[in-house]
Interface confidence: medium
Amino acid sequence: SIPWNLERITPARYRADEYQPPKGGSLVEVYLLDTSIQSDHREIEGRVMVTDFESVPEEDGTRFHRQASKCDSHGTHLAGVVSGRDAGVAKGAGLRSLRVLNCQGKGTVSGTLIGLEFIRKSQLVQPVGPLVVLLPLAGGYSRVFNAACQRLARAGVVLVTAAGNFRDDACLYSPASAPEVITVGATNAQDQPVTLGTLGTNFGRCVDLFAPGEDIIGASSDCSTCFVSRSGTSQAAAHVAGIAAMMLSAEPELTLAELRQRLIHFSAKDVINEAWFPEDQRVLTPNLVAALPPSTHRAGWQLFCRTVWSAHSGPTRMATAVARCAQDEELLSCSSFSRSGKRRGERIEAQGGKRVCRAHNAFGGEGVYAIARCCLLPQVNCSVHTAPPAGASMGTRVHCHQQGHVLTGCSSHWEVEDLGTHKPPVLRPRGQPNQCVGHREASIHASCCHAPGLECKVKEHGIPAPQEQVIVACEDGWTLTGCSPLPGTSHVLGAYAVDNTCVVRSRDVSTTGSTSKEAVAAVAICCRSRHLVQASQELQ
Amino acid sequence: QEDEDGDYEELVLALRSEEDGLADAPEHGATATFHRCAKDPWRLPGTYVVVLKEETHRSQSERTARRLQAQAARRGYLTKILHVFHHLLPGFLVKMSGDLLELALKLPHVDYIEEDSSVFAQ
């Protein structure tokens, strides 16, 4: 049948006529750093240029025979997945291959670095259209590998990599852990994370999204017309490289930040069976499966946001965790989460001219995560307004007082070790959309932003009895920018955004022996940009 | 995804001495760091990427590489410069004995040194 993977990435409403955006990636050059490839395979013949770059280690073992078809198998298959005539995602994309993996599929960090430099040099010598670099490989965490990827990304190149096949936290591998790289995990036809022998796809906060990666049909190097089924996060990354090529062909001016946000926006949400992931990784791992956008334009005319989790702070008393947005993104809100519930909140800070989200661990806590809400908003200008602890029964409050500034997020931070011992505010003023209200012992931070046509509203959802989870979602046309718990709930573990939904998690009070009857409430700030909507209407 | 984390091993060596009385030795207290892969079987000791500080002029990569070779030779060690980086990161790839790491970390302009390691098709 039509390969399941191509069907999966095609938007449902276009499956009937197998819609593909025009040009099929033809304006984009995809660089593949992998094994050698069989360039005369009918799937890729005429659309692949084998560069003269080769930097590979010797094969291991004295009895190893370099059988051409084996040497080419990995790269040929991936080239076919990216742009193959029959089984490819971006059938119009051109491919350039660099050999950095030997016949056993092994390479070195140094050899790959030299390959990345070769690409940068080529880009400087002969600037072409958008470039996508596919890195279907993984090694241990490498500072230098990640740094090189960062530099190349900042030079305007889109890097896509495999999350790794180690059934492990992708943050322990490179280039998967590089923030500027689009890191792809693998799912199968049942939307299960892919199992590979005793291992499987990597997961965690360093994964950006998942894509088909099991039983993927593609070019086989056994003969020039052969096909083969392969599995792995390389195959998943190849799908995303193909989708990226399609998107960049339709909108060549897209920045890396815009492309990443679109990939996330158009992904299928909440379809992956998370039970496969280790329990502590489920909340950190994005439940997203890549898909092509339903049309090639008008995608840009909405407010795009994504959630970025920090590394874990560690358990020391004064430990902090920092979450950062990408270069072209704006931090619109900051929240925190602790599995033990022991935290001292979070706040937005300036660091090197950029706003970051910092979360604070509390005494006896097992550590915290900072969670940044990172958005794309042209001509945005944000500031943080802070109110120190009020100490009054009404609690602490702060609002956006600058003309034209709207509230995009609320954070609170406290020095006391346990807010639970301090009585919460008895009253929450309502109907004040530009105001953050917090515990009287906490300092409250309002993220206030100005951008053309930006409007925001506050949405609350409360449950009278204690619940382990409360959610509130923004309606269609609105984007979640801020997510925080209603102040005063001492058993709150934290708050975080999942797609367009604000999730507030609490301890199960029945197990803690607490007789607290405190309500749990989630406060979402939903925004939209009238400016972007108008711009879109003018274009149509 | 962050540069700061990852379960990799970091060895920080403080630069304590004025190496060979160099006029442009680093200021007192400056540190360069050494990194290697946390997954032992993937390590490739004997090959190292020497990364220079971001603002380093491109001519410094060759100069630092030559200085390392000269100082190593004075100690009776052979080194081979395998590649000099210009376009992404300032630095160079060198084949040398691990015994020279402390010396290399004391070179002016060095930000960090990373031992080479394996990558694998996924």
Partner: antibody
């Protein structure tokens, strides 16, 4: 030599069970989807079931859904068809067929006859 | 399900003459994304398993004599044997592999006149 060899056919009473096997050789078994196709005496070809290269995905014809189970053992390079609640209309020669990975069958075994009769 | 209908049910052709078998699908098997028709032709000789002749509606499987050719697109397809040989006596089946359940035509029995 590239070949498929079926076994396990025979006479079975209605409501009974049978397990067919197909031993593959000469190609990388794990890389290819595999199928069972049957042919009733004097009749045409009827696709029964398919299983993907990793065994992660299976499909069945409506007529056998819930009664037949396709599986594979990559270490033994063997394809199986567990047939339960057999009916007279399941009587056929059962062929094991290698999938080109597109759904057409580029290698067939010689077949094994299953007769369901009381 | 996609229903495949072959015509004629049987056919007698003289040696050296052209034989033509038609196959019609109840819905298109053309996948627009790669412009391929997901249709194959098989030959089954008495007492033997089927053998793939043609895939993608018109591509000959390796080792198949060039007197066999396939044509057509969408819903209407043809298998042509340009010059019938004695060893071509068999039943011929078309098959769609556009989607599961994969379905075959009822078969066309080809004999020598």
């Amino acid at each position: 030599e590239v070949q498929l060899v079926e076994s396990g056919g025979g006479l079975v009473q209605p409501g009974g069970s049978l397990r067919l096997s197909c031993a593959a050789s000469g190609f990388t078994f794990n890389n290819y989807a595999m199928n069972w196709v049957r042919q009733a005496p004097g009749k045409g070809l009827d696709w029964v079931s398919t299983i993907s290269g990793s065994g992660g995905t299976t499909n069945y014809a409506d007529s056998v859904k819930g009664r037949f189970i396709i599986s594979r053992d990559s270490s033994k390079h063997t394809l199986y068809l567990q047939m339960n609640s057999l009916r007279a209309e399941d009587t056929a020669v059962y062929y094991c067929a290698k999938d080109s990975n597109w759904g057409n069958f580029d290698l067939w075994g010689r077949g094994t006859l299953v007769t369901v009769s009381s | 399900d996609i229903v495949m209908t072959q015509s004629p049910d049987s056919l007698a052709v003289s040696l050296g003459e052209r034989a033509t078998i038609n196959c019609k699908s109840s819905q298109s098997v053309l996948y627009r994304s790669n412009n391929r028709n997901f249709l194959g032709w098989y030959q089954q000789k008495p007492g033997q398993p089927p053998n793939l002749l043609i895939y993608w509606a018109s591509t000959r499987e390796s080792g198949v004599p060039d007197r066999f050719s396939g044509s057509g697109s969408g819903t209407d397809f043809t298998l042509t044997i340009s010059s019938l040989q004695a060893e071509d006596v068999a039943v011929y089946y078309c098959q769609q592999y556009y989607t599961t359940p994969y379905t075959f035509g009822q078969g066309t029995k080809l004999e020598i006149k």
